[in-house]
Amino acid sequence: HTAAQDNCTCPTNKMTVCSPDGPGGRCQCRALGSGMAVDCSTLTSKCLLLKARMSAPKNARTLVRPSEHALVDNDGLYDPDCDPEGRFKARQCNQTSVCWCVNSVGVRRTDKGDLSLRCDELVRTHHILIDLRHRPTAGAFNHSDLDAELRRLFRERYRLHPKFVAAVHYEQPTIQIELRQNTSQKAAGDVDIGDAAYYFERDIKGESLFQGRGGLDLRVRGEPLQVERTLIYYLDEIPPKFSMKRLTA
């Protein structure tokens, strides 16, 4: 069974409705907003999570230099269209018929257009750079310890295979986590780096998506690691297509 059988909840996604109406009375959970069944033994796709978020009631550097093609999610929240597998559809449109193309993490990678805009394929984001600044501590963290704990976090909490955590860089107070996952590397059942990065981002913001778990309490040799700002850069297998007007703005 895919959900916690005893009380029928989804450990990996609190933005679900669960009931024992699966085969043989098993617990089955559906994402808010889309109503799609989700596998509660792994992370839910970012597309379904964004859709659920939009449907929920609203409350009143040796650090890496991101390449010129790196995308930052400046557009913020939108209500996405997801395919039957829960992935982002390559073309997204809003209610006013403004459309744009997105990558596999749902970040816009073209200028906005109208309904005639074509997005031939969903371009995969194969490299994610998570740039963190931690709050002041008595001294710098040990780089090796930091690497060990962040790799453990992604492995244990987000179930991301260690081979996809390409590097952890540290120059106090900046930490950079590089996630890399080519299409050819991702096997069936592997957590997507985009989904892991999104769960991590929400954890860092104190908006954990896990059911009933406390917020993220990250410690390195007992010393709390408190993040005060996060920037995430996305690199696609095919560079984005923006007009020069945007690039020089």
């Epitope: 090796s144 790799r151 492995r155 590097a167 007992g222």
Partner: antibody
Framework: DVQLQESGPGLVKPSQSLSLTCSVT?????????WNWIRQFPGNKLEWMGY???????NYNPSLKNRISITRDTSENQFFLKLNSVTPEDTATYYC??????????WGQGTTLTVSS | DIVLTQSPPSLAVSLGQRATISCRAS??????????MHWYQQKPGQPPKLLIY???NLESGIPARFSGSGSRTDFTLTINPVEADDVATYYC?????????FGGGTKLEIK
């Protein structure tokens, strides 16, 4: 100095549950680190069973996932192992150990468990 | 699971000589800054004792006669010179991937 001490029944009947306690002195289990159970079979093979973290998260060896539970009592600075449906193959010396940053720097002395009717 | 194969299973070395124990992993246990391989010594009736962490770092209180080296899949524990107190079984352990796994052990004896 950090010290860990296991305690348990010594003998358990097949199909029953095994419960072990690890008492920790010299460090609060909520302050940091990961608190593990490791067992050593009669042929000396070592097997990592799982841990409970400083903030109460669990991580288990998939080979035991449906039978194992690791919990804690923060007021007593203890953590516990429960293993269900034991068989003679679970006969082993059970150790608790502290995982610092993915290696085990402090170990208990171990408690021997025999599964037999 | 990552399988760790230790060799030789047993080793007899003369006092004052060098002992070399090998541990081979079924896949890489390295990250960009770490090598997640560790070494332990176990004497009869005692728990394992940490000697070397992250491939080459000597644990506090361990004599400098013990050293570790290697990367990716091939790691070595060296004891030089061997002393009578070193008679024990030595284990490698990886922590790059869940579940953590141990090697089968190498028994060191004095020739």
């Amino acid at each position: 100095d950090v010290q860990l001490q296991e305690s348990g029944p010594g003998l358990v009947k097949p199909s029953q549950s095994l419960s072990l306690t690890c008492s920790v002195t010299g460090y609060s289990i909520t302050s940091g680190y990961y608190w593990n159970w490791i067992r050593q079979f009669p042929g000396n093979k070592l097997e990592w069973m799982g841990y409970i973290s400083y903030d109460g998260r669990n991580n288990y060896n998939p080979s035991l996932k449906n039978r194992i539970s690791i919990t804690r009592d923060t007021s007593e600075n203890q953590f516990f192992l429960k293993l269900n449906s034991v068989t003679p193959e679970d006969t082993a010396t059970y150790y608790c150990a502290r995982d610092t940053t993915a290696y085990f720097d402090y170990w208990g002395q171990g408690t021997t468990l025999t599964v037999s009717s | 699971d990552i399988v760790l194969t230790q060799s030789p299973p047993s080793l007899a070395v003369s006092l004052g000589q060098r002992a070399t124990i090998s541990c081979r992993a079924s896949e890489s246990v390295d990250s960009s800054v770490n090598r997640f391989m560790h070494w332990y010594q176990q004497k009869p009736g005692q728990p394992p004792k940490l000697l070397i962490y992250r491939a080459s770092n000597l644990e506090s209180g361990i004599p400098a006669r013990f050293s570790g080296s290697g990367s990716r899949t091939d790691f070595t524990l060296t004891i030089n010179p061997v002393e009578a107190d070193d008679v024990a079984t030595y284990y490698c352990q990886q922590s790059n991937e869940d579940p953590y796994t141990f090697g089968g052990g190498t028994k060191l004896e004095i020739k």
